[in-house]
């Protein structure tokens, strides 16, 4: 046993060594030799004991969805899709894996989180990290310059996720994007309107949408004295301001990233500010910031954006926040992020954010990265963080001890006596053919009590009971599970009666 443990330890160590050599880009010969050693060590472990030791689980950062969780998910998706469609979006789908080259250089520091697929001797492939880069690739490949689309699919990130907070390595994204050359800020405002509509419809609590602009950030860094090469890394520090204090962010910028303390202080004066359109106007008057072309453009667009947001009736949900510096490299203009707010402990306190539930922004340069001639297609979009929303909805339903139906069955075809299986089969078939969602128990002679109990557990509202007398009279006994009230319905009227009671349209066109 000790020998096996030692061998397992060596396999682990050798695996780490191989990974390390690959990361260090060691010589192919050395990697090949160390991989061969790893395989020999694994072979010595032998297959039999390792089978017994195999723990049945999903891979790290993934989960199964139970019927109950799926019911929650379907409801959330339904709200989102209805909103996307209401705004005139088409739907597309793209492969779950892309050429590695497609994804490279699009995510900055986050590139290390991309899952590479093991080389199968052909193309170098990676699992998609988001839906935006594949969308840009799709536009460039099909030479599209104009589309409004949504895409709901799983994406993959080699993160160390806190799954309790709704963070995973495989998770859904729900994206809505508008591509095309349009007048400034109209599509951007619609994206923010969609975000607010969805978050309001989901009833997951009060939320705030933080808005900023990449150009304002870049302009601000420039006037504060940050060199171009440090823009992105300082951005990632600033973006932590929603989680940690300014002091900690400053320490990181000065201590770890080599920024001069006075430069950090100048940045601090700006990034700790947040407000509404009045802050935009105040910054337009800022003697230094207003002299920077990029920042001035960004502020001008934000002023216009706030006008449209007011017309859309959502300006009260929006906060101009100079610390918002979303991590992805491809944003070029407006950026935004929706956070849920915890109710403050004391009245008058600042509302406290509990994590991003939606985000997005403008990325005018991404499609051009794929175009041989570098032709740009301006794009703006949003992504709903549905995994976090699923978690919140699930927790809320658990707290309320609310029963969630996991099927849509409208009626159970039951019998009160024995030897009526054939009649039940005939009736259930008639109901299916008429578009009724119906079930029966898979027993020849089920007890009536068991059938009624099944309805209660599954939340099935109606039971169609066949008995010998009913057959003679040409009726079916229709029973309401909750009220226990029973009525005889002529067989030819049964479909219509079930539809009437369950609020289903009478034609299934």
């Amino acid at each position: 046993m000790a020998e096996r443990a030692a061998l397992e330890e060596l396999v682990k160590l050798q695996g780490e060594r191989v990974r390390g050599l690959k990361q260090q880009k060691a010589s192919a010969e050395l990697i090949e030799e160390e991989v061969a050693k790893l395989l020999k060590l694994k072979a010595q472990l032998g297959p039999d004991e390792s089978k017994q030791k195999f723990v049945l689980k999903t891979p790290k950062g993934t989960r199964d969805y139970s019927p109950r969780q799926m019911a929650v998910r379907e409801k959330v998706f339904d709200v989102i899709i209805r909103c996307f469609k209401r705004h005139g979006a088409e739907v597309i789908d793209t492969p779950v894996f892309e050429l590695k080259e497609t994804l490279m250089g699009k995510y900055g520091e986050d590139s290390k989180l991309i899952y590479d697929l093991k080389d199968q001797g052909g193309e170098l492939l990676s699992l998609r990290y988001d839906l935006t880069v594949p969308f840009a690739r799709y536009l460039a490949m099909n030479k599209l310059t104009n589309i409004k689309r949504y895409h709901i699919a799983k994406v993959y990130r080699r993160d160390n996720p806190a799954m309790t907070r709704g963070r995973y390595r495989e998770f859904y994204q729900c994206d809505f994007d508008i591509a095309g050359n349009f007048d400034p800020m109209i599509p951007d405002a619609e994206c923010l309107k969609i975000m607010c509509e969805i978050l309001s419809s989901l009833q997951i609590g009060d939320f705030l949408v933080k808005v900023n602009d990449r150009r304002i950030l870049d302009g601000m860094f420039a006037i504060c004295g940050v060199s171009d090469s440090k823009f992105r890394t300082i951005c990632s520090s600033v973006d932590k301001l929603d989680k940690v204090s300014w002091e900690e962010v400053k320490n990181e910028m000065v201590g770890e990233k080599g920024l001069a303390p006075e430069v950090a202080d100048r940045i601090g004066d700006y990034v700790q500010q947040h407000g509404g359109v009045s802050l935009v106007e105040q910054l337009l008057q800022d003697p230094k910031l207003s002299q920077n072309k990029q920042a001035l453009e960004g502020l001008g667009d934000l002023k216009l954006l706030f006008e449209y947001l007011t017309l859309f009736g959502i300006d009260d949900k929006i906060s101009f926040d100079l610390s918002l510096a979303r991590g992805l490299d491809y944003y070029t203009g407006v950026i935004y992020e929706a956070v849920l707010l915890q109710t403050p402990a004391q009245a008058g306190e600042e509302p406290l954010g509990v994590g991003s539930v939606a985000a997005g922004g403008r990325y005018d340069g991404l499609v051009g990265m794929f175009d041989p001639k570098g032709r740009k297609v301006p794009c703006v979009g949003l992504s709903i963080g549905v995994e976090r929303i699923f978690s919140i909805v699930e927790q809320r339903l658990e707290a309320l001890e609310e029963k969630i139906r996991t099927t849509e069955t409208q009626v159970l075809v039951a019998s009160a006596q024995k030897k009526l299986l054939e009649e039940r089969l005939k009736l259930v078939s008639e109901l299916w053919d008429a578009g009724i969602k119906a079930e029966l128990l898979y027993k020849k002679n089920p007890k009536l009590l068991n059938q009624l109990q099944y309805c209660e557990e599954a939340g099935i509202p109606l039971v169609a009971i066949i008995g010998e007398q009913e057959l003679k009279d040409g009726v079916i006994k229709l029973r309401s599970v909750t009220s226990r009230e029973e009525v005889d319905v002529r067989r030819e009227d049964l479909v219509e009666e079930i539809k009437r009671r369950t609020g289903q349209p009478l034609c299934i066109c």
Epitope: A6, L10, E16, R17, E33, A36, K40, L41, Q44
Partner: antibody, heavy 120, light 107 residues
Framework: QVQLVESGGGLVKPGGSLRLSCAAS????????MTWIRQAPGKGLEWVSY????????NYADKVKGRFTISRDNAKNSLYLQMNSLRDEDTAVYFC?????????????WGQGTLVTVSS | DIQMTQSPSSVSASVGDRVTITCRAS??????LAWYQQKPGRAPKLLIF???SLQSGVPSRFSGSGSGTHFTLTISSLQPEDFATYYC?????????FGQGTKLEIK
């Protein structure tokens, strides 16, 4: 029984050559990486060279690179070290050893050693 | 090359004593470390590999610990046959190197 036995050591003049052999028995020789390790009189241990079970991988300490050649004959369960252009500092007891768990660069089975003396 | 430094270079102890020998690597070697015992005129004998795994047939009074750059070999209760020279060796990267040795003598 499981053992390694070295031979071929002796007195040789600087610039001379010598071929050491190591006979293995009691285990599947071809499965194992094998190595030569030496120890100068009254001194510590020094890794000289290794060879994989399939002959595919070999490596040498910088001090002996270009002068020593490691080889093996799996059919004869034998390991060899061809030493050319010998120097005074090559004087040592030469041990052959087997890698632990076939591929881990730690000697779990050693021969008794063979003394090589380089002197004019 | 990775340098291995053992301390002390010699230690005197009595039967029944607990003895600890330390080995430091000039750079991180994870757990790729072995300990050997060598008696005069004999080949080294493997005691510990992978920093803490006891080689089959080695008495349990020998134990190893550590990872990264700092490692120790402990003999919990010295026996007469334990008086010898002890070497550590890194197996992280070629050339695999040994410590200079620690001579354990009878007090």
């Amino acid at each position: 029984q499981v053992q390694l036995v070295e031979s071929g050591g002796g007195l040789v003049k600087p610039g001379g050559s010598l071929r050491l052999s190591c006979a293995a028995s009691g285990f599947t020789f071809s499965d194992y990486y094998m190595t030569w390790i030496r120890q100068a009189p009254g001194k510590g241990l020094e890794w000289v060279s290794y060879i994989s079970g399939s002959f595919r991988y070999t490596n040498y300490a910088d001090k002996v690179k270009g002068r020593f050649t490691i080889s093996r004959d799996n059919a004869k369960n034998s390991l060899y070290l061809q030493m050319n252009s010998l120097r005074d500092e090559d004087t040592a007891v030469y041990f052959c050893a087997r890698y632990v768990y076939q591929v881990v660069a730690i000697g779990d089975l050693w021969g008794q050693g063979t003394l090589v003396t380089v002197s004019s | 090359d990775i340098q291995m430094t053992q301390s002390p270079s010699s230690v005197s102890a009595s039967v029944g004593d607990r003895v600890t020998i330390t080995c430091r690597a000039s750079q991180g070697i994870s757990s790729w470390l072995a300990w050997y015992q060598q008696k005069p005129g004999r080949a080294p004998k493997l005691l510990i590999f992978a920093a803490s795994s006891l080689q089959s047939g080695v008495p349990s009074r020998f134990s190893g610990s550590g990872s990264g750059t700092h490692f120790t070999l402990t003999i919990s209760s010295l026996q007469p046959e334990d008086f010898a020279t002890y070497y550590c060796q890194q197996a992280e990267s070629f050339p695999y190197t040994f410590g200079q040795g620690t001579k354990l003598e009878i007090k």
